[in-house]
Interface confidence: medium
């Protein structure tokens, strides 16, 4: 977990339930200090593109990888459950070379039948020389990437290329895009669900179907819950992210699969190659597209995007810019809420949700996306709270 965006000073960590600050040494120490006990259930995270399992050490006030010694699938399931994933999502665990780690969390197998974190102790050695890697859900895998692909300046997507992409309909009309992260949860943009569209009964999600004409009554999934980021600002579009929980879980198949949420420790590079997809207009002020389109874009560093000739300090840490400063390729009306993804280690990661921009595909007006890295903590919290 990244303890970011907290109102507590660097030395304190905020309780979600009360907003009070507690000392980092009280976090994950086996005793509940927050009224909701969340200081004891945010003690595990997956780190980096290899999904290395890390546990927070209250003694050292830092995160450490878990040594493979005596580890088994049951502990893996428990760790995933604590992050907010359901048991039946669990994909696999692997082992990764400890790659120079000098500090580990190890299992004390004689600790008896206690909570997993009470079995873990701090160690400077790991005899297996391997750390635990966890896949809580089989995510980020597609059939084939798109051809160089009309968002504006894109081309139609191939079946299975963007299996996490959903079309979110209100009264049989495509309104926004979204991204599947589990069979039950969709990530979209908060501006898509501003009142009165914050009522879940307005929304139906269509997955695995690339043509709007083929999204017929009966093929959609009703939305049960809409959760908008509490700090979303409709004027500035800061914290422009929302979650939708479906009434019935999606059935994953070749054309319906989740994208991976980014893990802490994943560094995004300026000019990194990414893809956007959606049924948005293929020209500014145009109509929604009949077919799913996708396009390559490059990440644009925030400093550059905030320069006077681009967005002049409108870009916050909760936003990412992507596109081309010369224009020509961009997301547009109707793409909102949809994915900005990048591939690393042959896995597709959701790094942005389509948020805003000045016009479509204009020079010096790239697309702006919610920075999903900043929101993963919040996303997992909602998933966990929902049980």
């Amino acid at each position: 977990w990244k303890f970011m965006g907290s109102k507590c000073s660097n030395s304190g960590i905020e309780c979600d339930s009360s907003g009070t600050c507690i000392n980092p040494s009280n976090w994950c120490d086996g005793v509940s200090h927050c009224p909701g006990g969340e200081d004891e259930n945010r003690c595990v995270r997956l780190y980096g593109p290899n999904f290395i399992l890390q546990v927070y050490s209250s003694q050292r006030k830092s995160w450490h990888p878990v040594c493979q010694d005596d580890w088994n699938e049951n502990y893996g399931r428990a760790a995933c459950r604590d992050m907010g994933y359901k048991n039946n999502f669990y994909s696999s665990q692997g082992i990764v070379d400890d790659s120079g780690s000098t500090s580990f969390m190890k299992l004390n197998t004689s600790a008896g039948n206690v909570d997993i974190y009470k079995k873990l102790y701090h160690s400077d050695a790991c005899s297996s020389k391997a750390v635990v890697s966890l896949r809580c859900i089989a995510c980020g895998v597609n059939l084939n990437s798109s051809r160089q692909s009309r968002i504006v300046g894109g081309e139609s997507a191939l079946p299975g290329a963007w299996p996490w992409q959903v079309s979110l309909h209100v009264q049989n009309v495509h309104v926004c895009g979204g991204s599947i992260i589990t069979p039950e949860w969709i990530v979209t943009a908060a501006h898509c669900v501003e009142k009165p569209l914050n009522n879940p009964w307005h929304w139906t999600a269509f997955a695995g179907i690339l043509r709007q004409s083929f999204m017929f009554y009966g093929a959609g999934y009703q939305v049960e819950k809409v959760i908008s980021h509490p700090n979303y600002d409709s004027k500035t579009k800061n914290n422009d992210i929302a979650l939708m929980k479906l009434q019935k879980p999606l059935t994953f198949n070749d054309l319906v699969k989740p994208v991976c949420l980014p893990n802490p420790g994943m560094m995004l590079q300026p000019e990194q190659l990414c893809w956007i997809s959606g049924w948005g207009a293929t020209e500014e002020k145009g109509k929604t597209s009949e077919v799913l389109n996708a396009a390559k874009v490059l990440l644009i560093e925030t400093q550059r995007c905030n320069s006077r000739y681009v967005y002049d300090n409108l870009i916050t840490p909760a936003m990412i810019c992507a596109g081309f400063l010369q224009g020509n390729v961009d997301s547009c009306q109707g793409d909102s809420g949809g994915p900005l993804v990048t591939s690393k280690n042959n896995i597709w990661w959701l790094i942005g949700d389509t948020s805003w921009g000045s016009g479509c595909a204009k020079a010096y007006r790239p697309g702006v996306y919610g920075n999903v890295m900043v929101f993963t903590d919040w996303i997992y919290r909602q998933m966990r709270a929902d049980g």
Partner: antibody, heavy 121, light 111 residues
């Protein structure tokens, strides 16, 4: 090569049911839809519906709802169509045909051999 | 449902000449840069065979004498020069929306 092999001709009595099969080979069964098309003697083509083996989801032409039921068996890469309460109007050649799904350009690039169904007492 | 009207119902063409078959849709089948109209050839006792997809794209293995054109509601299949093996019934089919429908067919005979 890519093929759709259908079951042989059938002679059935009015009121009976019949299950026609369509075995796919030479491609990944779960990546494409299987469509069913009816052709009455000397007549044109009518689209009955599709099934997507990746998820089992189906779509029926309103005209054939209650008449045709589409299913699949992934393990044998076979699609089935059950025709129920047969009448002389159901006497026809039935084709299965492959189409892409999702982007659903919606054309049929591979066709089955056809199954001739005769309904007669 | 979109109704496809083919004309003529039948035509006789001499070897080496041009055959032109028309298909008119009851509403536009073009959107988002695509025209969702396809053409098939069917010979007696055989299944239909895809010739042209998305109005103008030649299916692989189909001779270049077959070509398709059109957008919106009016589409044409051209065969030039006609060869003996082209005697068959030709069908148009749309996939603009559901249900998918076919034209009634045009029977091509050789003079």
């Amino acid at each position: 090569q890519v093929q759709l092999q259908q079951s042989g001709p059938a002679l059935v009595k009015p009121g009976a049911s019949l299950k026609i099969s369509c075995e796919a080979s030479g491609y990944t069964f779960t990546y494409y839809s299987i469509n069913w098309v009816k052709q009455r003697p000397g007549q044109g083509l009518e689209w009955i519906g599709w099934i997507f083996p990746g998820s089992g989801s189906t779509y029926y032409n309103e005209k054939f709802k209650g008449k045709a039921t589409l299913t699949i068996d992934k393990s044998s890469s076979t699609a089935y169509m059950l025709l129920s309460s047969l009448t002389s109007e159901d006497s026809a050649v039935y084709f299965c045909a492959r189409s892409d799904y999702g982007s659903a350009y919606g054309y049929f690039d591979v066709w089955g051999t056809g199954t001739t169904v005769t309904v007669s007492s | 449902d979109i109704v496809l009207t083919q004309s003529p119902a039948s035509l006789a063409v001499s070897l080496g000449q041009r055959a032109t078959i028309s298909c008119r849709a009851s509403k536009s089948v073009s959107t988002s840069g695509y025209s969702y109209m396809h053409w098939y050839q069917q010979k007696p006792g055989q299944p239909p065979k895809l010739l042209i997809y998305l109005a103008s794209n030649l299916e692989s293995g189909v001779p270049a004498r077959f070509s398709g054109s059109g957008s919106g509601t009016d589409f044409t299949l051209n065969i030039h020069p006609v060869e003996e093996e082209d005697a068959a019934t030709y069908y148009c089919q749309h996939s603009r929306d559901l249900p998918l429908t076919f034209g009634a067919g045009t029977k091509l005979e050789l003079k």
